[in-house]
Interface confidence: low
């Protein structure tokens, strides 16, 4: 053999009970001593220090801590050290050493020793990772290292939880002994947090020690709180709120059409939306995620605003009894009523469209003119105003005439035309035509679609002579002979004696 | 006006403890991290870490640590830089030099320094 | 940690006159996250503390005169000054603040 010794390097025994640390020893076969005897030392291998003595087999002198707490289990002559410890209290706890005295100069401390722990709580084994949905073992670990008094095990709190399962004592690997209880269960993400128990009780004692461990019980992301569908008015300020319920803590992101708004590692998030405007209206989503899953809810921004200035299109200018077709259209949050005037007639009305067609089958004259299309919600109002231009050929009023005055005759031609037309007058008796570019003789004056030429004839003629006016433009032409009406019908002030 | 003002000039001998002192004005101290840069004479700029205002939390860079200590007195807007067993090698200007906190911490900001200390001159000579 | 190459380590150029000085990362110092370039440039005039010229490779910092000129991505980087004033002279350190803080050697500016 050689110098050696063999002990657990820890044990562990609860307080008030006994603790037995296994113990052998060796050494050189030649050595023949003819006594073995030993010591076990407190917290110092070296004797020089006058370390605290535990047992010493050569006298029954020990330090006051051990006085009548100690034995030796082992028979030295046979190499075994065993060492018990009774009523043991927290002071005991620390680092014991044996040292072999086999007389003479052989003398040995071995540097192998035991470090006694005095616990007064059960262990209770959770697995690193605790996942919800994913089965479970806990176990409750105790010390079972005295012969006098043996642990027995419980769970406290574990309803709900399974049976538990004891699997009586163990060995471990240094010699000492534990007992243990299993529970085998499938968390919940409720179960996070919950405070398990485990309580070891020793029969025909009061001794009674409880352990308990929190569950860190990892789970995915639920998304608990969220806007429900938002509505705010351009230039608002909007707030959204996305709160996860999740472990570890989730990366909690606001996504608008795959683009990051704001992220961080929360359980909830803000995201704060300063003076809104249409072009943030939309779907907003938030994205709640850790390593056990993700979970991801919307919330939709409806952005109120007042109607843009409507646009129009179609076609501005028609020759009559064409079909007219025109589009007002706008953009507005509510969708607005649309509605289209002329002259504060209205045409076609439409709710909560942000179209309005206006069909006009067969223009005629009467159509033409201004036209407002007016937009309104209850954020606002808008218009835009524009005009239809319907073309026609010249048509010849009833107020067209001739009248005679001393030595003047008046001659009023009045066609309504779109385009202007352009306007003759016949003298058929003189085989004469005189036409609106001659100023000498006629005066043209046009006030909107209505063109009023005059033809004035100066001399005196013994009858009143045929006048015939012609307009014409590119859709055809008309001819009418001016019928003459007595002085009293003229329009103009006759001027003279 | 943002300063930070840095206390005066030490000569020390090796082995004693150095405090050097940088108080800030003009702006939030909590809103702003304060570092600590060592520029040894005629040497370049050499970072030694930096303390959160706003939590108390130190960073030491990887030459910086043992004897260099950063703390706070934030009620008077002041950071301190403590240099224990002073070394001839300690001789050198210590500067202060805010940095923006970014308390998300997702979108990475950096810490860019914006505003520095006018320097504090330790000599350390037996 | 990242090392900072500056170079030249020290240049003379006259009054009015333009400067470019060098900075090399050992490593990318652009961050693929948010496409920045965690570089800055700093200005120390003699016997002052540094004064922040330039930060995120090329944006200047309020009140820092446009001939300053930051430029360069992932370990390449330029500092440029167009038009050289006496008041330039300085030593000019650049410094990386995406890992651990380092700053670069330096480039001695000095007027002829």
């Known amino acids: 053999g050689h110098w050696g010794a063999w002990m657990p390097s820890s044990i562990s025994a609860f307080e008030g009970t006994c603790v037995s640390i296994p113990c052998r020893f060796d050494f050189p076969d030649e050595l023949r001593p003819a006594v073995v005897h030993g010591v076990w030392y407190f917290n110092s291998p070296y004797p020089k220090n006058y370390p605290p003595v535990v047992f010493k087999s050569r006298t029954q002198v020990v330090h006051e801590s051990f006085q009548g707490r100690s034995r030796l289990l082992g028979d030295l002559g046979l190499r075994n050290c065993t060492l018990l410890l009774s009523n043991v209290s927290p002071e005991l706890g620390g680092k014991y050493y044996f040292r072999g005295d086999l007389g003479g100069y052989n003398q040995y401390t071995f540097s192998e020793h035991s470090v006694l722990d005095i616990v007064n709580t059960p262990n209770i084994v959770v697995p690193p990772e605790v996942v919800a949905g994913t089965e479970v073992e806990v176990s409750c670990m105790v010390p079972d290292n005295c012969p006098e008094l043996r642990p027995e095990l419980s769970w406290l709190g574990h309803e709900g939880l399974g049976e538990p399962a004891v699997l009586g004592r163990l060995r471990e690997d240094e010699g000492t002994w534990v007992q243990v209880s299993l529970l085998h269960f499938v968390p919940t993400r409720e179960a996070n947090g919950h405070r398990l128990g485990c309580q070891a009780s020793f029969p025909n004692t009061t001794l009674q020690f409880e352990g308990y461990a929190s569950m860190d019980v990892k789970y995915p992301p639920v998304i608990v709180e969220m806007n429900s569908s938002v509505e705010a008015i351009e230039g608002s300020h909007v707030s959204l709120l996305c709160g996860a319920d999740s472990n570890p803590p989730p990366l909690l992101t606001w996504m608008r059409d795959g683009t990051v708004l704001r992220e961080a590692v929360a359980e909830s998030l803000l995201l704060e939306l300063e003076e809104v405007t249409p072009a943030e209206d939309g779907v907003y989503a938030c994205l709640a995620e850790n390593a056990y899953g993700q979970d991801n809810r919307t919330v939709g921004l409806s952005v109120m605003y007042a109607p843009w200035k409507p646009t129009v299109n179609g076609t501005m200018v028609a020759v009559e009894g064409e079909t007219v077709s025109i589009l007002c259209s706008t953009q507005s949050n509510p969708d607005p009523i649309l509605t289209i005037f002329k002259e504060k007639q209205i045409l076609s009305t439409v709710i909560y469209e942000s179209e309005l067609q206006l069909e006009l089958p067969a223009v005629s004259p009467e159509d033409d003119g201004e036209y407002w299309c007016v937009a309104e919600n209850q954020y606002g109002q808008r218009a835009t105003a524009f005009n239809l231009s319907v073309e026609f050929a010249p048509v010849l009023l009833l107020e067209s005439h001739c009248a005679a005055a001393r030595d003047t005759v008046q001659c009023l031609c009045v066609v309504k035309s779109n385009p202007e037309p352009s306007v003759a007058f016949e003298l058929p008796s003189r085989n004469v035509t005189v036409n609106e570019s001659e100023r000498e003789f006629v005066y043209s004056e046009r006030s909107g679609l209505v063109l009023t030429s005059i033809l004035t004839l100066r001399g005196q003629a013994q009858a009143p002579p045929r006048v015939i006016c012609t307009a014409r433009n590119l859709y055809g032409a008309k001819s009418l002979e001016l019928p003459f009406q007595g002085a009293h019908r003229l329009m103009w002030a006759k001027i003279g004696p | 006006e943002i300063q930070l003002v840095q206390s005066g000039p030490e000569l020390k001998k090796p082995g004693e403890t150095n405090k050097i002192s940088c108080k800030a004005s003009g702006y939030t101290f909590t809103n702003y991290g304060m570092n600590w840069v060592k520029q040894a004479p005629g040497k370049g700029l050499k970072w030694m870490g930096w303390i959160n205002t706003y939590t108390g939390e130190p960073t030491y860079a990887d030459d910086f640590t043992g004897r260099f200590a950063f703390s706070l007195e934030t009620s008077a807007s002041t950071a301190y830089l403590q240099i224990s067993n002073l070394k001839n090698e300690d001789t050198a200007t210590y500067f202060c030099?805010?940095?923006?906190?970014?308390?998300?911490?997702?979108?990475?900001?950096?810490?860019?320094?914006?505003?520095w200390g006018q320097g504090t001159l330790v000599t350390v000579s037996s | 940690n990242i090392m900072m190459t500056q170079s030249p380590s020290s240049l003379a150029v006259s009054a009015g006159e333009k400067v470019t000085m060098s900075c090399k990362s050992s490593h990318s110092v652009l961050y693929s996250s948010n496409q920045k370039n965690y570089l800055a440039w700093y200005q120390q005039k003699p016997g002052q503390s540094p004064k922040l010229l330039i930060y995120w490779a090329s944006t200047r910092e309020s009140g820092v005169p446009d001939r300053f000129t930051g430029s360069g991505s992932g370990t390449d980087f330029t500092l440029t000054i167009i038009n050289v004033h006496t008041e330039d002279l300085a030593v000019y350190y650049c410094?990386?603040?995406?890992?651990?803080?380092?700053f670069g050697t330096g480039t001695k500016l000095e007027i002829k």
């Open positions: 030099a805010r940095n923006p906190i970014n308390y998300y911490g997702i979108n990475y900001e950096g810490y860019v320094m914006d505003y």
């Open positions: 410094h990386q603040y995406l890992s651990s803080l380092t």
